[in-house]
Amino acid sequence: KNLKSPQKVEVDIIDDNFILRWNRSDESVGNVTFSFDYQKTGMDNWIKLSGCQNITSTKCNFSSLKLNVYEEIKLRIRAEKENTSSWYEVDSFTPFRKAQIGPPEVHLEAEDKAIVIHISPGTKDSVMWALDGLSFTYSLVIWKNSSGVEERIENIYSRHKIYKLSPETTYCLKVKAALLTSWKIGVYSPVHCIKTTVENELPPPENIEVSVQNQNYVLKWDYTYANMTFQVQWLHAFLKRNPGNHLYKWKQIPDCENVKTTQCVFPQNVFQKGIYLLRVQASDGNNTSFWSEEIKFDTEIQAFLLPPVFNIRSLSDSFHIYIGAPKQSGNTPVIQDYPLIYEIIFWENTSNAERKIIEKKTDVTVPNLKPLTVYCVKARAHTMDEKLNKSSVFSDAVCEKTKPGNTSK
């Protein structure tokens, strides 16, 4: 009886794992083995595919074959018993195009209100992604184990920290990789769960802001308690993208080591041009806080994104605010050649209840004010570019009294 060729051959490539699966064409014939040949583009001869010779099952692995993953190859298969079937040719394919990104490795560390996620490619020193190592981005899905309500976080790198979590709570997450340059989305990792710790005695510093004064950077933050010392560290932001490297060499800012105030001043020349991460930690001598949220600090933008300057024209029931270019030292206006959005905060002088207006225009009306009442206003600028999401510090507050009634026209 003539042996029939195997059919429906599927090539599955995940990272550097090359798997072939096929269907037996005749289930009734026992003791059949299968063998594959391969042919590279531009070659006439067929070569035996190592790892896929005389296979008794309907699956084989040819990962050991050192292929050029960008080069097209063709495969053929036949069945063998006493005689052999005819060859069945598989459509030619390019391994890189066919390859899927495998599940990444995930390593979790817990704090009281944060989780640090370290992500590595699933295959170390992968041949398939050798030219794309730095192009991987990751996305994750996280949920509280008790609720199951999922939150998605896109476009993260090999180290990511999630803040504002609850202490003593189990969170679960899964991560997948993407190579956006090649339109490839990977498969999810297994689910990993970790429990946040008991609440730490000392909270981390909050609301870290960087501003420029003369030739110095001024770093300010808020802290709950007095009589503390603080330290500030920085890291090159690009280091978060380094695949497989999970040793982050945070560096001290010398003028911000063991400072006793909630701010520190250091020369601009401490940092060369670039994008950095900054973090602050508090200590009372016995206990230490966890590190603050890491803020992104772009020297290029920071140097120019100064708080806006504004004038107020007071009416009985509103303020007209005219926003102008900020002034550098020497009173020369700064030319900001990127689109800005303005955040204006105002409040009654006798109250803490703040209201907010966000405007793209440089002339803004603050409506619904009471006559003969002192209101205070402060403003800050934000870049509109999502990639460089930067904000200036707030301007100093300016307080003005509204006019008596019936002067709104």
Epitope: L108, A110, T197, V198, E201, L247, K249, Q252
Partner: antibody, heavy 118, light 107 residues
Framework: QVQLVQSGAEVVKPGASVKVSCKGS????????MHWVRQAPGQGLEWIGR????????KYAPKFQGRVTMTADTSTSTVYMELSSLRSEDTAVYYC???????????WGQGTLVTVSS | DIQLTQSPSFLSTSVGDRVTITCKAS??????VVWYQQKPGKSPKVLIY???YRVSGVPSRFSGSGSGTEFTLIISSLQPEDFATYYC?????????FGQGTKLEIK
Amino acid sequence: QVQLVQSGAEVVKPGASVKVSCKGSGFNIKDYYMHWVRQAPGQGLEWIGRIDPEDAETKYAPKFQGRVTMTADTSTSTVYMELSSLRSEDTAVYYCARGGNFYVMDYWGQGTLVTVSS
Amino acid sequence: DIQLTQSPSFLSTSVGDRVTITCKASQNVGTNVVWYQQKPGKSPKVLIYSASYRVSGVPSRFSGSGSGTEFTLIISSLQPEDFATYYCQQKNNYPYTFGQGTKLEIK
């Protein structure tokens, strides 16, 4: 493979200094931290400090501050730990260790016995 | 400095026993704890890092757990080669500190 090879045993007099070396191979020391840990006879482990060979930045345990100096020579993949004003309680085995991913001391040298005796 | 207190300091035990070693930190260190094994005359060897991650090549009978201030190393079924001294270490803050050690002896 990764290896850390330390200099040989030393006998030194009280008040003197000792300099122990640790040569790394199988990895680039600039990509890691290098730590020093000591162990007095029959006692536990005690962290002395660490150096970042890339820029020579150091962190020392307060107990050793002022007496210890760590240096690195990246051209020979060697780090050094010098301890001064030695006293008898500094008698210990001194280990160097590589600080790798997740800040773990993942590879250790074989240890160098420093004996402080008059 | 963060103090780490291990218990017990000594443990007489037998092959096949389940062993639990605890490590208490004087303040919250997250999950930044490492466990080492040290045999006489040898350098320490990492077993567990980040509280619960087993180093590649370490037998599955070793496991770690805990977070915050309380950590545990469990050896599920003691083997002859496991008789050694075990240390916990925190890597949350400088200076790094070690527990005083737990010595496992054959009963």
